[in-house]
């Protein structure tokens, strides 16, 4: 799987997850968040090359597709697969409010 | 929605579904399918600017992150949302065979 | 050059479960259906059934319906014949074998080495 | 099914003989112009190798001496010249009906 255990240990230059740090207030201008101050959220990149943790039926015929015709542009593209949440606290006034994200987390990737 | 009403009608330069055709003796070496010998599988390419389309919190984020630090090189990327199947037909022996095959049409693409 | 290497020898029991593998390399295992074919000790060649790699699209002989199942891993080239309900008779060699690639049934060009299954209790 | 009927079950012959096997279908395995009849050739210990596909087309890298005729039902595999390396179990297969049927095997052993 191309999960943060493998792509974390390896020098892979195929679709992977990579590591990419947020801060809340400085990357996306977000100050009302009180904790956590950043997470990683990471993300996908890499080229997908024929086969690579395909997707879909789709998937593997576009990669297919590629391999036979290498002057085509149309390839598939590395992105998440699982992800997970991220629980913030912030104030509504001066009441604390915990809240859970959806999604918030790359924890692996495919070629889609 | 970036869908084949949309995207075929318009020149979009970002994220959207794009005509393929796909022959599948000529383009995938698969002698063995009678009916049809090709189809439009579509693919999605385009860029994802900040909230096209986003797939999910993560995406906006990263979306987000983007847009406020350009020279990062993590952004979303433009990946089929809706697919359809395709039927086709093939020989065993003499006998006809008819198979559905699952996510095969790219009908409208996300930014994930 | 196009090479078919399976899994080693395997000793089972009545009643039990062997799932053999074959690894493709050397063409684009995508375009072409894989067959399995056994062969008792002494004994002809015996047709399983079919896979084709892309689509996961499966025919079994009808003799195995039921009791086998094919399989492929497209991220390693690796196709699998899992075969249950073992009886004594189901003691042979199994061949992979990749159909030539003009129809779903076809001639066979390329072959596995083999991969022998002894049923005894 | 069909039944592939292939004969002599076995024959001695000696290098730089001529060698013909039959094979027998037991319904046409002809269909859209082509005759649906293969022929492959196994030595002990090893994997069946293609020699013949389509009845009479020789697989790359088989020699001359190998050939294949027929139609219908009835098919034959020659070998021109026999070679000390030919020795070895020859079987026919058809791939008109589901499932994909072959023969019982020729066996050609050294005089």
């Known amino acids: 799987a191309l999960d943060t255990n493998y792509c974390f240990r390896n020098l892979e230059e195929n679709c992977c997850v990579r590591p990419l740090y947020i801060d809340f207030r400085q990357d996306l201008g977000w100050k009302w968040v009180h904790e956590p101050k950043g997470y990683y959220a990471n993300f996908c990149s890499g080229p997908c090359p024929y086969l690579r943790s395909a997707d879909t039926t789709h998937s593997t015929v576009l990669g297919l597709y590629n391999t036979l015709n290498p002057e085509a542009s149309a390839s598939p593209c590395c992105v998440p697969q699982d992800l997970e949440p991220l629980t913030i606290l912030y104030y509504v006034g001066r009441t604390p409010k915990v809240e859970q994200l959806s999604n918030m987390v790359v924890k692996s990737c495919k070629c889609s | 929605a970036l869908d084949t009403n949309y995207c075929f009608r318009n020149l979009e330069e970002n994220c959207c579904v794009r005509p393929l055709y796909i022959d599948f003796r000529q383009d995938l070496g698969w002698k063995w399918v009678h009916e049809p010998k090709g189809y439009y599988a579509n693919f999605c390419s385009g860029p994802c600017p900040y909230l096209r389309s986003a797939d999910t919190t993560h995406s906006t984020v990263l979306g987000l992150y983007n847009t406020l630090n350009p020279e990062a090189s993590a952004s979303p990327c433009c990946v089929p949302q809706d697919l359809e199947p395709l039927t086709i037909l093939y020989y065993v022996g003499r006998t006809p065979k008819v198979e559905q095959l699952s996510n095969m049409v790219v009908k409208s693409c996300k930014c994930s | 050059q196009v090479q078919l290497v399976q899994s080693g020898a395997e000793v089972k029991k009545p009643g039990a479960s062997v799932k053999v593998s074959c690894k493709a390399s050397?063409?684009?295992?995508?375009?072409?259906?894989m067959n399995w074919v056994r062969q008792a000790p002494g004994q002809g060649l015996e047709w399983m059934g079919q896979?084709?790699?892309?689509?996961?699209?499966?025919n079994y002989g009808e003799m195995f319906e039921g009791r086998v199942t094919m399989t492929t891993d497209t991220s390693t080239s690796t196709a699998y014949m899992e075969l249950r309900s073992l009886r004594s008779d189901d003691t042979a060699v199994y061949y992979c074998a990749r159909g030539i690639g003009n129809y779903a049934l076809d001639a066979m060009d390329y072959w596995g080495q083999g991969t022998l299954v002894t049923v005894s209790s | 099914d069909i039944q592939m009927t292939q004969s002599p079950s076995s024959l001695s012959a000696s290098v730089g003989d001529r060698v013909t096997i039959t094979c027998r279908a037991s319904e046409s395995v002809d269909w859209w112009g082509n005759s649906f009849m293969h022929w492959y050739q196994q030595k002990p210990g090893k994997a069946p190798k293609l020699l013949i596909y389509?009845?009479?087309n020789l697989e790359s890298g088989v020699p001359s001496r190998f050939s294949g005729s027929g139609s219908g039902t009835d098919f034959t595999l020659t070998i021109s010249s026999l070679q000390p390396e030919d020795f070895a179990t020859y079987y026919c297969q058809q791939n008109i009906e589901d499932p994909l049927t072959f023969g019982g095997g020729t066996k050609v052993e050294i005089k």
């Open positions: 896979i084709f790699p892309a689509l996961g699209s499966t």
């Open positions: 389509l009845a009479s």
């Open positions: 050397g063409y684009t295992f995508t375009s072409y259906w």
